[in-house]
Amino acid sequence: TNQGNSADAVTTTETATSGPTVAAADTTETNFPETASTTANTPSFPTATSPAPPIISTHSSSTIPTPAPPIISTHSSSTIPIPTAADSESTTNVNSLATSDIITASSPNDGLITMVPSETQSNNEMSPTTEDNQSSGPPTGTALLETSTLNSTGPSNPCQDDPCADNSLCVKLHNTSFCLCLEGYYYNSSTCKKGKVFPGKISVTVSETFDPEEKHSMAYQDLHSEITSLFKDVFGTSVYGQTVILTVSTSLSPRSEMRADDKFVNVTIVTILAETTSDNEKTVTEKINKAIRSSSSNFLNYDLTLRCDYYGCNQTADDCLNGLACDCKSDLQRPNPQSPFCVASSLKCPDACNAQHKQCLIKKSGGAPECACVPGYQEDANGNCQKCAFGYSGLDCKDKFQL
């Protein structure tokens, strides 16, 4: 629903777009470091024409928290990186720190990797809407495409045949799945490709029955699909890589006219565009909001999260395009040289995490960071990561795929 005298219709920059309702993925609670969003929560039409300074908005109350440095999140609820597109290339093991209470990918692993999800392949490559000046209409969110890869009727296990290549992790939705690459990469054509990261928050109206905790529900999958379709429309398939859903949280409606029976969620996302894109944080925000406002849909607003804040870094001239190169904020530190995220100093990764095919993760809520092999590898007696035996995959080679 994108019309209403509301509190969030106007972003800190200038922009717009549109789309329908809900869906997500159950994978692993890949709780990426959460960062403060530079959201401006103002009434739909601000009284001033100049953009207000970005502030954090929780939409649920009038309190405006000050941006907190990114921290590692271990809540197992709706913090699930859900990609919403597909396209990327990785190869290097960026050992970023991730946390998770449970992994709901294809096996009940304890840990979680800092990978970025991406659709295994999308059945429905949605062609970008033509913005033909004087011609057809704006991109409208009427077609709900399922950007899934593996299909089945019930909530089966679409990851059982290990469809994800290039050491990416298969993440299960309802009856589809996507492949999760390392942070900053997106999955495309069976490889993880490096892209440009654009973190943000999108507000979406959902059905009253939507439960952000039910990551295997059809509604969650639909949400994922909707967001993917929107972004694919906005950026086009040549530029769009994928969108990862990090968290889904319910809050009060940003529109002043909405009533209590309207359900509205804030979806924290990371959009990964092709490395060659000329888009920057400002143009990305503007394009998305322009699209949202062009027609009537479930999307309410998109707010930018500064990339440097997302990584926990001090601002740089290039807006922290390289998370590995930026300087951590004073109260944070990089858990290890290969982590793009700066975190609270107590969460330091062991030095051994720099080894090949290793990653840093928190296996238990509140636990200390540990080193583990990336999916597709397991530790041998010497502590080195070796490729899984034929027929096995996933974290610690616990996933047996059917031949």
Partner: antibody
């Protein structure tokens, strides 16, 4: 508060052109699509098209292609609609509107008569 | 394009009476929006996103529906409700309006 102030009534000759204006205030003009709607006397509403002032992007109802041209001036927060080759069929009240938040101008009455 | 058919075209109701008017879309739309227009004035947004009342709209009004079938209801007609009501979709381009339902007071 938000206001959309339209230009005054016009009486023009058939075959000529006219440019109607809609001055916006109270919101970020360049970030919301401006729509134009036609209403003939005693008739219903008909969508003409929309313009995104931020970059000038436009979409038209096919029935109005070649008839209406939408433009916007960000510096003055004003949207314009030019109607060309006017006939008596173009006699109507024309509204500018921001559908997103439900704001409408007061309407401009256009009379085409010889 | 999506055609919106409103019915009835004209109706009258006595004060206190319940009023229902419908809007049928030729194909499915995400949301329907309703406008109230009185003679010589611009349309006012009345109900948006199918069921949300615009600012200042009395609680006796309601909207519902999904897909291709939508309706506007007044629980208890009042004199000031006499007007023409238009439904609109702007989910799909070109955006379209219904032909209107004229509501008169008996």
């Amino acid at each position: 508060q938000v206001q959309l102030q339209q230009s005054g009534a016009e009486l023009v000759r058939p075959g000529s052109s006219v440019k109607i204006s809609c001055k916006a205030s109270g919101y970020a003009f360049s970030t919301y699509w401006m729509n134009w709607v036609k209403q003939r006397p005693g008739q219903g509403l008909e969508w003409i098209g929309q313009i995104y002032p931020g970059d000038g992007d436009t979409y038209y109802n096919g029935n109005f292609k070649g008839k209406a041209t939408l433009t916007a001036d960000k510096s003055s927060s004003t949207a314009y609609m030019q109607l060309s080759s006017l006939t008596s069929e173009d006699s109507a009240v024309y509204f500018c509107a921001v559908f997103w938040d439900g704001y409408w101008g007061q309407g401009t009455t256009l009379t085409v008569s010889s | 394009q999506i055609v919106l058919t409103q019915s009835p075209t004209i109706m009258s109701a006595s004060p206190g009476e319940k009023v229902t008017m419908t809007c049928s879309a030729s194909s499915s739309v995400t949301y329907i929006h309703w406008y109230q227009q009185k003679s010589g004035t611009s349309p006012k947004r009345w109900i948006y996103d199918t069921s949300k009342l615009a600012s200042g709209v009395p609680a006796r009004f309601g909207g519902s529906g999904s897909g291709t079938s939508y309706s506007l209801t007044i629980n208890s007609m009042e004199t000031e409700d006499a007007a023409t009501y238009y439904c609109q979709q702007w989910s799909s381009n070109p955006f379209t309006f219904g032909s209107g339902t004229k509501l008169e007071i008996k």
